[in-house]
């Protein structure tokens, strides 16, 4: 298969309000060169959740768990989840350029929020 895959293994994740949500994403290659970003929702109105290179994302931390040779971990954890955080989260690979262009997206992980 040509180039890389973006793998979001969890179709859905359910988290209690006030807890942290871990959103898993692995990528099979660094090539093409370019950043990974996380979004909630799709299309032009999507919301940027995390971009390592720039921006301030106080509730997001990176979670690198995979030591496998065949992929690299770009998972994140979002703390203090509220009902407003519900939605589908996408891990997106960009190709470096001026500007960077979207290359491939994961299938998405739907986050649902349970009452405490």
């Amino acid at each position: 298969e040509e180039e890389l895959q973006v793998i979001q293994p969890d179709k859905s994740v359910s988290v209690a309000a006030g807890e942290s949500a871990i959103l898993h994403c692995t990528v099979t290659s660094l090539i093409p060169v370019g950043p990974i970003q996380w979004f909630r929702g799709a299309g032009p109105a999507r919301e940027l959740i995390y971009n390592q290179k720039e921006g301030h994302f106080p509730r997001v931390t990176t979670v690198s768990e995979s030591t496998k040779r065949e992929n690299m971990d770009f998972s994140i954890s979002i703390s203090n989840i509220t009902p407003a955080d519900a939605g589908t989260y996408y891990c997106v690979k960009f190709r470096k350029g001026s500007p960077d262009t979207e290359f491939k997206s994961g299938a998405g992980t739907e986050l649902s929020v349970r009452a405490k």
């Epitope: 298969e1 040509e2 180039e3 099979t28 290659s29 660094l30 090539i31 093409p32 060169v33 370019g34 950043p35 990974i36 390592q52 990176t62 979670v63 690198s64 030591t67 040779r69 065949e70 992929n71 690299m72 971990d73 770009f74 998972s75 994140i76 190709r95 470096k96």
Partner: antibody, heavy 118, light 112 residues
Framework: EVQLVESGGGLVKPGGSLRLSCAAS????????MSWVRQTPGKGLEWVAT????????YYPSSVKGRFTLSRDNAKNSLYLQMNSLRAEDTAVYYC???????????WGQGTTVTVSS | DIVLTQSPASLAVSLGERATISCRAS??????????MHWYQQKPGQPPKLLIY???NLESGVPDRFSGSGSRTDFTLTINPLQAEDVATYYC??????????FGGGTKVEIK
């Protein structure tokens, strides 16, 4: 067993051209990112070029960009480096290297020597 | 460019003792908590051989006396205990998403 065998090195005058080849076996070549890395006694190891598994994307450092062209033929399990406008500072041992993820250089060939001299 | 500075340039260690090599990057090589720093061993007349990938992962077939640690800008390769066959030059290499990818200048390990 993974094998990478480089060929095509030799003595060339400044301004001349050479084409290096790397024949791969023992792994699924079309799934791997491939690169060339060179080594000189003075400058140590230097990354020279990288190509994506399908051949769509290529990357070069500024020291060779515009002079070197990397290509691959997945049907022949082969990697090629076309080197033009060669300079004395291109003199080095050139290694072919494979990478499953485009991250580390997992396997290396034995190298082929390029000498640029008048 | 990200500059990798290895220290020391050469190291003499007694058999059975610990050898420690440092690699410092001019800027972080971490992406999402993963450090894109790798270590290679090169013996005279041979190509480099991958030992450690992504800072701390031991390549298949490499003896567990080799270990790697560190994050962001500071990394260490440790050989413990040092064996005679470990005499070689060791290189660090970064492959973050900022081109060009670069190598350290190498550390030559010898037996004291």
């Amino acid at each position: 067993e993974v094998q990478l065998v480089e060929s095509g090195g030799g003595l060339v005058k400044p301004g001349g051209s050479l084409r290096l080849s790397c024949a791969a076996s023992g792994f699924t070549f079309s799934s791997y990112v491939m690169s060339w890395v060179r080594q000189t006694p003075g400058k140590g190891l230097e990354w020279v070029a990288t190509i994506s598994s399908g051949g769509t994307y290529t990357y070069y450092p500024s020291s060779v960009k515009g002079r070197f062209t990397l290509s691959r033929d997945n049907a022949k399990n082969s990697l090629y480096l076309q080197m033009n406008s060669l300079r004395a500072e291109d003199t080095a041992v050139y290694y072919c290297a494979s990478s499953l993820t485009g991250s580390s250089f997992d396997y290396w060939g034995q190298g082929t020597t390029v000498t640029v001299s008048s | 460019d990200i500059v990798l500075t290895q220290s020391p340039a050469s190291l003499a260690v007694s058999l059975g003792e610990r050898a420690t090599i440092s690699c410092r990057a001019s800027e972080s090589v971490d992406l999402y908590g993963t450090s894109f720093m790798h270590w290679y061993q090169q013996k005279p007349g041979q190509p480099p051989k991958l030992l450690i990938y992504r800072a701390s992962n031991l390549e298949s077939g490499v003896p567990d006396r080799f270990s790697g640690s560190g994050s962001r800008t500071d990394f260490t390769l440790t050989i413990n205990p040092l064996q005679a066959e470990d005499v070689a030059t060791y290189y660090c290499h970064q492959s973050s998403d900022e081109l060009p990818w670069t190598f350290g200048g190498g550390t030559k390990v010898e037996i004291k």
